[in-house]
Interface confidence: low
């Protein structure tokens, strides 16, 4: 599930992070949701994925890889703009919808190569593939219109990820699951 490191990360890796909270360790918090999030790793100088429990934690937690890089990697946006000029659509944009096998229900977006648009789909929380974005804006920037200027910025509204347990199981199981909101 881990995102591959960008060249821009290693190019900027020796610099100090922009904010003190970028130096904090990833903190999943005490709750039990499984929300894919990102943190800045002081040791690798890269933004990396971790699974957030849905409550508490700390400020070194971002909904998207892009947001993490912008916040914690000095000069990232400048370098990213340079890298994006004439950008091509990454191969993973053409992957089929893959909800994965786990039974959490997360609202995600994927690029549909038939309609040439980013669309909503439901992700199960594990496995799956990289044609899977937390926000419509991120999907559009990477797959629909790569290198095509800035995205929504502050207009991009991050909806809280919700996981709701699947209620039906094999008939003999009694469920005592909690809903995480």
């Amino acid at each position: 599930l881990s995102e591959e490191a960008d060249d821009t990360d290693s190019e900027l890796g020796s610099m100090k992070p922009l904010h003190t909270f970028c130096a904090m360790k990833a903190d999943d918090g005490p709750c039990k949701a499984m929300i894919r999030s990102y943190f800045f790793n002081m040791y690798t100088h890269q933004c990396e994925e971790f699974i957030y429990g849905g409550c508490e934690g700390n400020e070194n937690r971002f909904d998207t890889l892009e947001e993490c890089k912008k916040t914690c990697i000095p000069g990232y946006e400048k370098t990213a703009v340079k890298a994006a000029s004439g950008a091509e659509r990454p191969d993973f944009c053409f992957l089929e919808e893959d909800p994965g096998l786990c039974r959490g229900y997360m609202k995600r977006y994927l690029y549909n190569n038939q309609t040439k648009q980013c669309e909503r789909f439901v992700y199960g929380g594990c496995l799956g593939n990289r044609n899977n974005f937390e926000t419509l804006d991120e999907c559009k920037k990477i797959c629909e219109n790569p290198g095509g200027g800035s995205g929504g910025g502050l207009n991009d509204i991050f909806e809280a990820q919700k996981i709701e347990w699947h209620e039906g199981g094999p008939p003999h199981h009694h469920h005592h699951h909690h809903h995480h909101h």
Epitope: I51, P99, L101
Partner: antibody, heavy 120, light 113 residues
Framework: QVQLVESGGGLVQPGGSLRLSCAAS????????MSWVRQAPGKGLEWVSA????????YYADSVKGRFTISRDNSKNTLYLQMNSLRAEDTAVYYC?????????????WGQGTMVTVSS | QSVLTQPPSVSGAPGQRVTISCTGS?????????VHWYQQLPGTAPKLLIY???NRPSGVPDRFSGSKSGTSASLAITGLQAEDEADFYC????????????FGGGTKVTVLG
Amino acid sequence: QVQLVESGGGLVQPGGSLRLSCAASGFTFSSYAMSWVRQAPGKGLEWVSAISGSGGSTYYADSVKGRFTISRDNSKNTLYLQMNSLRAEDTAVYYCAILGATSLSAFDIWGQGTMVTVSS
Amino acid sequence: QSVLTQPPSVSGAPGQRVTISCTGSSSNIGAGYDVHWYQQLPGTAPKLLIYGNSNRPSGVPDRFSGSKSGTSASLAITGLQAEDEADFYCQSYDSSLSGSVVFGGGTKVTVLG
């Protein structure tokens, strides 16, 4: 009552092929991801492969990738594992299991297993 | 070598409390993924004992309990009984491996006397 019954195991020579089946009953088969897990004699459990409820997504452990193929026929409530280019290290009891019904990534119900022996 | 590490064996007298540890890393248990436990009685298939770190499926006695902290998890059996003699396996999910689903090596629980 939920039941999984594996069949198709047996003795096969190295390089040979075998197809395992798992007949499911007592639940809505097409609603659940299914998986194969194996256990070599005297050893621990090893995840082999998994498939989504629709059959559209499949996943494999590195040790079997390119040699094994998981599939399902939802009209027959049956899960399959096609095993090609078998090796001695594939010798194990193969279990089919329902994946992720009660909790993310747990194997809820297991079959009784079928023994596969790869030997010359 | 299993991705999740369990002690090969633990033992206890009837009525005693025994615990089995399951140690992982920051890419599996430490990343927030659930831990599940299975009991395998001699000559039988594994059975789900604890799911989602600490939940018991119906029919599992409350003598069995699970917990998770940091990069490790543990299974406790209180009031050990002769019929608890079995192999116990922990299992989780690992985001750093293409294998993804990972098991511990198993722990043999022996009931003494």
